[in-house]
């Protein structure tokens, strides 16, 4: 079952999937000036068994003014994220959350792709939310959100995440988006 | 198949200066938040620095802060990280990665630090001698 609404927006946060499930489909969009191929599908679907889940399909862009140009492919992704996940695993802070059975990755970039991605979520799937530069997070419980069946109908629950106002680094050492500081430590992050 | 090609590595006395520049090819840049990690002999491999695609925010791990600075050419698909007054520590071999940004073109530094990334270069190795 598909959900009918997008998460929910928080102010000053972003969100991301940490892993799709299966029943999620990715549309294979091209930015400007390229267009999916002829014979390509226009969505990536995240399917598997309880063991392995993958993504059918690949997305292909190619220019929209070539003919018989040479086509543009996906990486697969399983292979691109076992590779990544065994190079990253001592400093996976979700490797629990990534490694879930029913799930896929996030697919790698493909060639020319559009900016946005767009995913038609399944019910289950959550999730997780993040502050962005210069806010800091205020806590009231789990800053995710979590697509569930209610009466029929779909919704997303509520990330219970307040994101607050710029800090002064100077005034709050270390407190700058402290809720996943994995070495504890300021860092540095300006916006042009 | 959309790769990520490092280059500008190499060996330069303590004080001097390299600039690494990560080429990725067909990479949507609007979408990702594109920069560099670095892993130094027996340690684990820290996320040095970053910038969005989107809108230019950058990020910096500490130790590298006043002396390194992350750029991009978008038109040419490339990023760039000029790296002064090196130091013995910064010895390390570099990596370009991509993350793909989340929702509403936006990126948390947290995402940066955990090293999960989408893509991974090959590296490049830089060197600092005493």
């Known amino acids: 079952e598909l959900c009918d609404d997008d998460p929910p927006k928080i102010t000053h946060a972003t969100f991301k999937a940490v892993a799709y499930k299966e029943g999620t489909m990715l549309n294979c969009e091209c930015k400007r000036g390229f267009r999916r191929i002829k014979s390509g599908s226009p969505y990536m679907l995240c399917t598997g068994n309880s063991s392995h889940s993958s993504w059918d399909n690949q997305c292909q862009c190619t220019s929209s003014a070539a003919r018989n140009t040479t086509k543009q492919v996906t990486p697969q992704p399983e292979e691109q994220k076992e590779r990544k996940t065994t190079e990253m695993q001592s400093q996976m802070q979700l490797a629990d959350q990534v490694s879930l059975p029913g799930h896929c990755r996030e697919p790698p970039p493909w060639e020319n792709e559009a900016t946005e991605r767009i995913y038609h979520f399944v019910v289950g799937q959550t999730v997780y939310y993040q502050c962005v530069q210069g806010y800091r997070a205020l806590h009231r419980g789990p800053a995710e959100s979590v697509c569930k069946m209610t009466h029929g109908k779909t919704r997303w629950t509520q990330p219970q995440l307040i994101c607050t106002g710029e800090t002064e680094p100077s005034q709050f050492p270390g407190e700058e988006e402290p809720q996943a500081s994995p070495d504890g430590l300021p860092e540095s992050e300006t916006s042009r | 198949q959309l790769q990520l090609v490092e280059s500008g590595g190499g060996l330069v006395q303590a004080g001097g200066s390299l600039r690494l520049s990560c080429a990725a090819s067909?990479?949507?840049?609007?979408?990702?938040?594109i920069g560099w990690f670095r892993q130094a002999p027996g340690k684990e491999r820290e996320g040095v620095s970053y910038?969005?695609?989107?809108?230019?925010?950058?990020y910096y791990i500490n130790s590298v802060k006043g002396r390194f600075t992350i750029s991009s050419d978008n038109a040419k698909s490339t990023v760039y990280l000029q790296m002064n007054t090196l130091k013995p520590e910064d010895t390390a071999v570099y990596y370009c990665?991509?993350?793909?940004?989340?929702?509403?073109?936006?990126?948390?530094?947290?995402?940066?630090?955990?090293?999960?990334?989408?893509?991974w270069g090959k590296g490049t190795q830089v060197t600092v001698s005493s």
């Open positions: 990665a991509v993350d793909r940004l989340g929702s509403q073109g936006r990126y948390a530094s947290a995402w940066w630090r955990s090293g999960d990334m989408d893509l």
């Open positions: 067909g990479l949507t840049f609007e979408g990702y938040a």
């Open positions: 910038i969005t695609g989107s809108d230019g925010t950058t």
